[in-house]
């Protein structure tokens, strides 16, 4: 009998409200033995895969997805999923990334000003949908 795969978790560092032009890292976590972590954006058709998986603890593995310079277009809902042969896990909860105007001044990143975004309720996806394996050799639209 195949093992039940635990749901992955997702977090963002340093947080979920990021100044325009600053960097953010999404951290996906799952059990040991994960081969591929996938960070999905808004829908399953937009994602990034990585096999750069490290062991976070004796029982957990993790992958980090970094955006070096956050733009307004990076705002949205993100979630994680992983592939532990021979199957894919279910999705993590959604995490919402908000982009805020940087505080300004001569030392701020050289980026176009964006609209200020206040904190919002982070939606959660508790569905248990099956996730079809990614087609080898095909790549959906990249996240960034």
């Amino acid at each position: 009998q195949e093992e039940d795969l635990p749901r992955p978790s997702i977090s963002a560092e340093p947080g979920t409200v990021i100044p325009l032009g600053s960097h953010v890292t999404f951290v996906c976590r799952g059990p040991v033995g994960v081969q591929t972590f996938r960070l999905e954006r808004d829908s399953r058709s937009t994602y990034n895969d990585t096999e750069d998986v490290s062991q976070a603890s004796p029982s957990e593995s993790e992958a980090r997805f970094r955006i070096d310079s956050v733009r307004e277009g990076n705002a949205g809902l993100y979630r994680c999923i992983y592939y532990k042969p021979p199957k894919w896990s279910e999705q993590s909860d959604y995490l919402e990334l908000l982009v805020k105007e940087s505080s300004g001044g001569p030392d701020s990143p050289d980026t176009e000003p964006g609209s200020s975004a206040g904190p919002t309720q982070r939606p959660s996806d508790n569905s248990h949908n099956e996730h079809a394996p990614a087609s080898q050799g095909l790549k959906a639209e990249h996240l960034y």
Epitope: S11, P14, H23
Partner: antibody, heavy 118, light 108 residues
């Protein structure tokens, strides 16, 4: 009023273990990340790690393996093992999440002193 | 591993004067830098975050700025109550969380 308070400090022999407890009131641990920071006598602040709202933990590289953070609905524990004299310090529990940043701390406990000595 | 180098280790200034503290990051941390004040026997108090934004209730005598990976913290119109140790901290990531070594400010 919102507050955090550490307890469980004291004298421990080298090689021993100790669990510190941070008790929170006035807010929910399901809404805030909680961190641990320590300060050796007369020295600077040293970040240990934190526990995310949903229970995921992150640690400083030097703390991995010997320090474990866990939580209940109203407390956050720091379990320390294989203690050495270099672990002698005041241990602070702090609430993260200021300006929505995980490890930006604006609410701290008074600290609890841990002394490692034979 | 990221290192925050804070200078000077100690500084003395007169009431009404100005003190400047520097914090150099060994790698890029964007503007993810905070400044804390700590008085003897007390926990730290958050003063500034995002390099230059004042935390709630902090007077405008406290100011922070950033130039690349170098951060500056200034206290103007010094008061006796400002005598304390000040720390910079990066909250960039759990892989790079760090505090500077601290600067003790004495008021003459």
């Amino acid at each position: 009023e919102q507050s955090v308070e550490e307890s469980g400090g004291g004298l421990v022999a080298p090689g021993g273990s100790l669990t510190l407890t941070c008790t929170v009131s006035g807010f929910s641990l399901s809404n805030y990340h909680m961190g641990w920071v320590r300060q050796a006598p007369g020295k600077g602040l040293e970040w240990i790690g934190y526990i995310y709202t949903h229970g995921t933990t992150f640690y400083a590289s030097w703390a991995k393996g010997r320090f474990t953070i866990s939580k209940t609905s109203t407390t956050v524990d720091l379990k320390m093992t294989r203690l050495t004299t270099g672990d002698t310090a005041t241990y602070f529990c702090a609430r993260g999440g200021y300006a929505d940043y995980n490890i930006l701390y604006n609410l701290w406990g008074p600290g609890t002193l841990v002394t490692i000595s034979s | 591993e990221l290192v925050l180098t804070q200078t000077p280790a100690s500084v003395e200034a007169a009431v009404g004067g100005t003190v400047t503290i520097n914090c150099q990051a060994s790698q890029s941390i964007s503007s993810y830098l905070a400044w804390y004040q700590q008085k003897p026997g007390q926990p730290p108090k958050l003063l500034i975050y995002d390099a230059s934004d004042l935390a709630s209730g902090v007077p405008s005598r406290f100011k922070g700025s950033r130039s690349g990976t170098e951060f500056t913290f200034t206290i103007s119109d010094l008061e006796c109550a400002d005598a304390a140790t000040y720390y910079c901290q990066t909250y960039d990531s759990s892989t790079t969380a760090a505090f500077g070594g601290g600067t003790e400010v004495e008021i003459k």
